[in-house]
Amino acid sequence: IPVIEPSVPELVVKPGATVTLRCVGNGSVEWDGPPSPHWTLYSDGSSSILSTNNATFQNTGTYRCTEPGDPLGGSAAIHLYVKDPARPWNVLAQEVVVFEDQDALLPCLLTDPVLEAGVSLVRVRGRPLMRHTNYSFSPWHGFTIHRAKFIQSQDYQCSALMGGRKVMSISIRLKVQKVIPGPPALTLVPAELVRIRGEAAQIVCSASSVDVNFDVFLQHNNTKLAIPQQSDFHNNRYQKVLTLNLDQVDFQHAGNYSCVASNVQGKHSTSMFFRVVESAYLNLSSEQNLIQEVTVGEGLNLKVMVEAYPGLQGFNWTYLGPFSDHQPEPKLANATTKDTYRHTFTLSLPRLKPSEAGRYSFLARNPGGWRALTFELTLRYPPEVSVIWTFINGSGTLLCAASGYPQPNVTWLQCSGHTDRCDEAQVLQVWDDPYPEVLSQEPFHKVTVQSLLTVETLEHNQTYECRAHNSVGSGSWAFIPISAGAHTHPPDEFLFTP
């Protein structure tokens, strides 16, 4: 570490005095201090002498000696006071620039340490400091405003009490710059716009930033629009607003509008599309198939997307039959707005009952007229089966009726022994009926089919079973000839809450 002579931390001299500061190190050494006149520098290998024959208040400051070759970067310092009775302050800089929330050092150095007790910081023209200005003082460095705020960008003077009188320094301008987090924040309203030719329209582009230095413009299909700008300062942010007012829109006004704002941090832009139409419109669509099949007891949500301008004047869900004249409960109908011109309407049908199959229509109205979208809802049922013994054209015949939806397939089984249901080990014969006769097939109803099995003689120690199945489930009926009547095995259990 270099050594300074005289070996004192502070040196106090009078103006006009001769001052010699000598620094000695192991290698070459360098001096660093405030820029001031009258110093001469003499270097001789490992020592360097800084001297003046006529010290002035401007020589007040801290002089540091460093050894550039020292890997530890050691240094030594001495503070020089040149106490001038007429000049209590040596101001090293008349402008200080910091970012908000940083400490700001106002470098007014006291030329006489004795004056430290009577120093203060004021704003120019004798104004007190702004409220909550938190500062400290060091005779070596000056006043530090802690965590400087933008509003503290002011002209300051350092004040010292000399013989009962306040003596001011020259002024120091503090510039506290806002920390700009990024490009200005933007809003473009509306996000989408539709108008009928001849109507009025308004598009508002606004940008805001903590700093006033930013630009904003509105462009239409890449053409910058000349719009007067409104400026405001609100909630600690500068705001610039461009408002495009169109009294009577025409097709040439349609297209893409972009709001663009830029500052030193970069550029932000946001866009919207303006559509001009000849007349009102109302379009209904659904992402769902309009023909729906749902298992009885389950739930279904019917969704309709509506695109409309002007807005809807009315809408409702209607049940068109065929089973009853009930109408959907309003509480089951839900509307959500995706944006200004697009809406989704949902009808919730929980735990569907047989009487709720049929046609559901969504109707909507706006100045463009009425539109409707109709869903056809068919319920799926597992097969229900019954078997009877009868004679057809003199032949003994087992007649199996199965009803369900979708249309059930029918299979006959003959098995040994008396059983509720034939299992594989007992099966003697299997007959598939690929084309059972359709007895009834009305929209939204179950399909009923009939299958005939001609049996010349009924084997009494055997069971004849009719099985029906579809995509929902299966059902069967076991016919046992020796019993007083046939024994039925009902359809697979199927639960639902009515």
Partner: antibody, heavy 122, light 111 residues
Framework: EVQLQQSGPELVKPGASVKISCKAS????????MNWVKQSPGKGLEWIGD????????TYNQKFKGKATLTVDKSSTTAYMELRSLTSEDSAVYYC???????????????WGQGTSVTVSS | DIVLTQSPASLAVSLGQRATISCRAS??????????MHWYQQKPGQSPKLLIY???NLESGVPARFSGSGSATDFTLNIHPVEEEDAATYFC?????????FGGGTKLEIK
């Protein structure tokens, strides 16, 4: 809900001292300067001083230096003001009011206590 | 200290009309587009309530019929339309430098 609950009314003799309290609840105590304001019929609203609960740093209106002493107890989130050498001139309602410590610079007193009436009478 | 002068000292306004209260500061209370003037409402037997901060910013929960404007030394509080519950005394306050000071108050009466 933010509350500044002040201590009850005081009737004191001339020359005596009084210490009034202001308990803050539902706020982060150290995020606000606590101000004290005097309201007397003849003089309107007068700012007495403020205290920064973070470090106990105080600023006083020159007029009330030597008259008022501001302190805080961070653990109980309570601010105190002691008034000494009381005279009839000190009879007034005293309010505590919080002032947000922020980068917003505004320093408006956004919540006030209900006030403590101090009557100085022999 | 900065002196704030409010005018008028009192005013009577009909229900639904506009009330305008003025506050003049002896020194500028503005700096860099920030106007450190605030407005408070005080009803009898109650503590003051902040209405407007930094000249024109409406405090949360305050009805939009209250508005503030002004810069440097001249500031205005407007109430429109005036409602029955607005009968109170209104104070301005500066916070640019210590000590913060208050105006003498304006008493608003509803006719």
């Amino acid at each position: 809900e933010v509350q500044l609950q002040q201590s009850g009314p005081e009737l004191v003799k001339p020359g005596a001292s009084v210490k009034i309290s202001c308990k803050a609840s539902a706020i982060t105590f150290t995020d606000y300067y606590m101000n004290w304001v005097k309201q007397s019929p003849g003089k309107g609203l007068e700012w007495i001083g403020d205290i920064n609960p973070n470090n106990g740093g105080t600023t006083y209106n020159q007029k009330f230096k030597g008259k008022a002493t501001l302190t805080v107890d961070k653990s109980s989130t309570t601010a105190y003001m002691e008034l000494r050498s009381l005279t009839s001139e000190d009879s007034a309602v005293y309010y505590c009011a919080r002032e947000k410590i922020s980068m917003e610079y505004y320093y408006a007193m956004d919540y006030w206590g209900q006030g403590t009436s101090v009557t100085v009478s022999s | 200290d900065i002196v704030l002068t409010q005018s008028p000292a009192s005013l009577a306004v009909s229900l639904g009309q506009r009330a305008t209260i003025s506050c003049r500061a002896s020194e500028s209370v503005s700096s860099h587009d920030i106007h450190l003037m605030h407005w408070y409402q005080q009803k009898p037997g109650q503590s003051p309530k902040l209405l407007i901060y930094a000249a024109s910013n409406l405090e949360s929960g305050v009805p939009a019929r209250f508005s503030g404007s002004g810069s440097a030394t001249d500031f205005t509080l407007n109430i429109h339309p005036v409602e029955e519950e607005d009968a109170a005394t209104y104070f301005c306050q500066q916070s640019i430098e210590d000590p913060p000071t208050f105006g003498g108050g304006t008493k608003l009466e509803i006719k």
